[in-house]
């Protein structure tokens, strides 16, 4: 029994004066607590607690369930205990079958013994199955068997407490271990879409998916730079004992322009936190913005190909697109497609493929696009570069030599005189008159130039060359002169193409 200094309160004394007492089932338990300030006896086993205000605790016919710790307490709060085993060969274990563990923590299999003298007190797997190799335990006859550092893999493990009695193995009722997992990583969060574009009045709904090992993960939607509590709806699934999924859906039933901003889905557990954001842009009405991918003024050589390409942003989705030339709509030769397959895509591409363009096919090509809110258009001015063509080359009645050439860009006409039989006409002749004539063709067509020289300047036989040229090429026409006496004649004019 404990001894204390005189004058200090001392704990009660118990008879019999030992820490453990073994009695047989059916025998009497008689415990006496001696203390002038006696308050109560308390009996504890598993989750059961009983009290007795008598200083003598008497159980006439002891049962296995009377096994447990008997504590006597005095008015100073000091106490003394004795542990009583009620040996019952038919009931070797007292059990509380609830068995819960936290991953990486110890947990107690509550199967205290009624007989401390049995041997090989341990755990066994159900139906003869072996326990996990790494499972470590410490037996304590008064409390049960402590499993050390519970693993996630032990979840749903079926086991028995076991002892050897008279050479035979005796098993308790079965226990099923339920393990609550520890968080060993941050939650995995994802969002249904990274950005949303809406018109005023439309519903905004975005879903955040949170995945973790258990439902105790915390999650919330937050508006960046705002403390306003957002209305969320949750759904969840237990895809497995350690595979939990929550969907947190944020809804604004009628979005306004000032709802635009960044929304964050935030999740945390005891390991750490994770977040993902989505951007909402609310516009008062739809829009279309067109961006030409090439210059809107296009120069192309005769017979070559050109692609007119636009990118455009359209919200809501484009409904009608067309390419127009000279009030005619193209039914083919063009394609229109989204810039990306992303669900949030608002950017599109339209391409008109013009092949082997003729000089007569210059002009304004217009792309038109519309959606339910707006229309938009862009025009391309296409100029077809053509080498000059000499339309007329004549000697006029007034003695003038006239050369008319057409082409694009505007041709330049130069005159040369070749005396005698020389092949090369190098001596240039200044024109008397040069005019750019209005073309009768469509706009963006060939430009017509007329140039004249005075033939009276020529005193010898020879050839006059009219050379029309531009960036694309050149063409020449020739006038042959022969003098008969004092008369000058124009002999058959002819043209010669010089590439």
């Amino acid at each position: 029994q404990p001894s204390v200094s005189p004058g200090e309160p001392s704990p009660p004394s118990i008879h019999p004066g030992k820490s453990d007492l073994i009695v047989r089932v059916g025998d009497e338990i008689r415990l006496l607590c001696t203390d002038p300030g006696f308050v109560k006896w308390t009996f504890e086993i598993l989750d059961e607690t009983n009290e007795n205000k008598q200083n003598e605790w008497i159980t006439e016919k002891a049962e296995a369930t009377n096994t447990g710790k008997y504590t006597c307490t005095n008015k100073h709060g000091l106490s003394n205990s004795i542990y009583v085993f009620v040996r019952d060969p038919a009931k070797l274990f007292l059990v509380d079958r609830s068995l819960y563990g936290k991953e990486d923590n110890d947990t107690l299999v509550r199967c205290p013994l009624t007989d401390p003298e049995v041997t090989n007190y341990s755990l066994k797997g159900c139906q003869g199955k072996p326990l996990p190799k790494d499972l470590r335990f410490i037996p304590d006859p008064k409390a049960g068997i402590m499993i050390k550092s519970v693993k996630r893999a032990y979840h749903r493990l079926c086991l028995h407490c076991s002892v050897d009695q008279e050479g035979k193995s005796v098993l308790s009722e079965k226990f099923i271990l339920k393990v609550r997992p520890a968080f060993k990583a941050v939650p995995v969060v994802s969002v249904s879409k990274a950005s949303y574009l809406l018109r005023e009045g439309e519903e905004f709904t975005v879903t955040c998916t949170i995945k973790d090992v258990s439902s105790s993960v915390y999650s919330t939607w937050k508006r960046e730079n705002s403390q306003t509590k957002l209305q969320e709806k949750y759904n969840s699934w237990h895809h497995g004992d350690f595979n939990y999924e929550r969907q947190a859906t944020l809804t604004i039933s009628s979005a306004r322009v000032n709802d635009s901003g960044v929304f964050m889905c935030y999740a945390n557990n005891t390991f750490g936190s994770a977040n993902v954001t989505t951007t909402l842009e609310v516009v008062d009405k739809g829009f279309i913005n067109i961006f030409p991918m090439i210059n809107t003024t296009v120069f192309v050589n005769d017979g070559e190909n050109v692609d007119l390409i636009v990118e455009y942003e359209a919200f809501p989705k484009p409904e009608h697109q067309q390419w127009i030339y000279m009030n005619r709509t193209f039914t083919d030769k063009w394609e229109d497609y989204p810039k990306s397959e992303n669900e949030s895509n608002i950017r599109y591409v339209s391409e008109l493929h013009l092949t082997r363009l003729k000089g007569t096919e210059g002009g304004t090509y217009t792309f038109l696009v519309s959606n339910s809110d707006v229309n938009a258009a862009i025009a391309f001015n296409v100029y077809v570069n053509t080498k000059p063509e000499i339309l007329t080359y004549d000697r006029l009645v007034n003695g003038m030599l006239q050369c008319v050439a057409a082409g694009f860009p505007e041709p330049t006409i130069d005159w040369y005189f070749c005396p005698g039989t020389e092949q090369r006409c190098s001596a240039s002749v200044l024109p008397v008159d040069v005019q750019t004539l209005n073309s009768s063709g469509p706009p963006f067509g060939k430009l017509v130039v007329q140039s004249s020289i005075d033939s009276s300047a020529f005193k010898h036989n020879g050839t006059v060359e009219c050379k029309a040229y531009n960036d694309v090429g050149k063409t020449s026409a020739y006038f042959n002169f022969a003098f008969k006496g004092n008369n000058k004649e124009q002999i058959h004019p002819h043209t010669l193409f010089t590439p």
Epitope: Y100, H155, R156, K178, V179, R180, S214, S215, S216, V217, Y218, S219, T220, Y234, N235, S236, W237, H238, H239, G240, D241, R246, A267, N269
Partner: antibody
């Protein structure tokens, strides 16, 4: 010993409000998810709302969404259900139920219930 | 939402007889996340079976559960007078959590 004690029920007119409480004892309240389940007179069980033990998830049946709010005060070991815009069909015994240790939505302990009557 | 349909609505049997209660789900209940509860008159429900077939601590072994996917069964191997109650199945795989309509077990 686990105990759950509901209170706050009573007679209320349609459109009115009530706040139910559930006082918990005998276990570490903050370690467990909790739910409210109701039972209309002579009818079956209907899950109403749940709250995670970290407070990290609040769930509602469609029939009460937007009208009822679940909350908890771990310092007081108490679960609450704020019920607004009450309707006749909300008349029921309301039970608070404790999740099992290892999994939410599975209930190993229930209170005795509190009766809510919505009538004019 | 997973809808649970219980049958029969009422089961009347003599003591000692075998009672078989059925619970059918509108879609698969993954991982056998299905429970059975017993509710006696004037009392709250009591958990009997979870994981479709695991008996809760303290539940007599005459109660057993079986099944997976969409079809589940609660069996009382030898009906006792104290088993008179309404029995509910419940899925806890996904929210909203749902209960079956219940089967009333009576003694004939």
């Amino acid at each position: 010993e686990v105990q759950l004690l509901e209170s706050g029920g009573g007679l209320v007119q349609p459109g009115g409000s009530l706040r139910l409480s559930c006082a918990a004892s005998g276990f570490t309240f903050s370690d467990y998810g909790m739910s409210w389940v109701r039972q209309a007179p002579g009818k079956g069980l209907e899950w109403v709302s749940a709250i995670g033990y970290g407070g990290g998830g609040k769930y509602y049946a469609d029939s009460v969404k937007g009208r009822f709010t679940i909350s908890r005060d771990n310092s007081k070991n108490t679960l609450y259900l704020q019920m607004n815009s009450l309707r006749a069909e909300d008349t029921a015994v309301y039970y608070c139920a404790k999740d099992t240790w290892w999994l939410a939505g599975l209930f190993d302990y229930w209170g005795q219930g509190t009766l809510v009557t919505v009538s004019s | 939402e997973i809808v649970l349909t219980q049958s029969p609505g009422t089961l009347s049997l003599s003591p000692g007889k075998r009672a078989t209660l059925s619970c059918r789900a509108s879609q698969s209940v993954s991982n056998s996340y299905l429970a059975w509860y017993q509710q006696k008159p004037g009392q709250p429900p009591k958990l009997l079976i979870y994981w479709a077939s695991t008996r809760e601590s303290g539940v007599p072994d005459r109660f057993s559960g079986s099944g997976s996917g969409t079809d589940f069964t609660l069996t009382i191997s030898s009906l006792q007078a104290e088993d008179v109650a309404v029995y509910y199945c419940q899925q806890y795989y996904s929210t909203p959590l749902t209960f079956g309509g219940g089967t009333k077990v009576e003694i004939k």
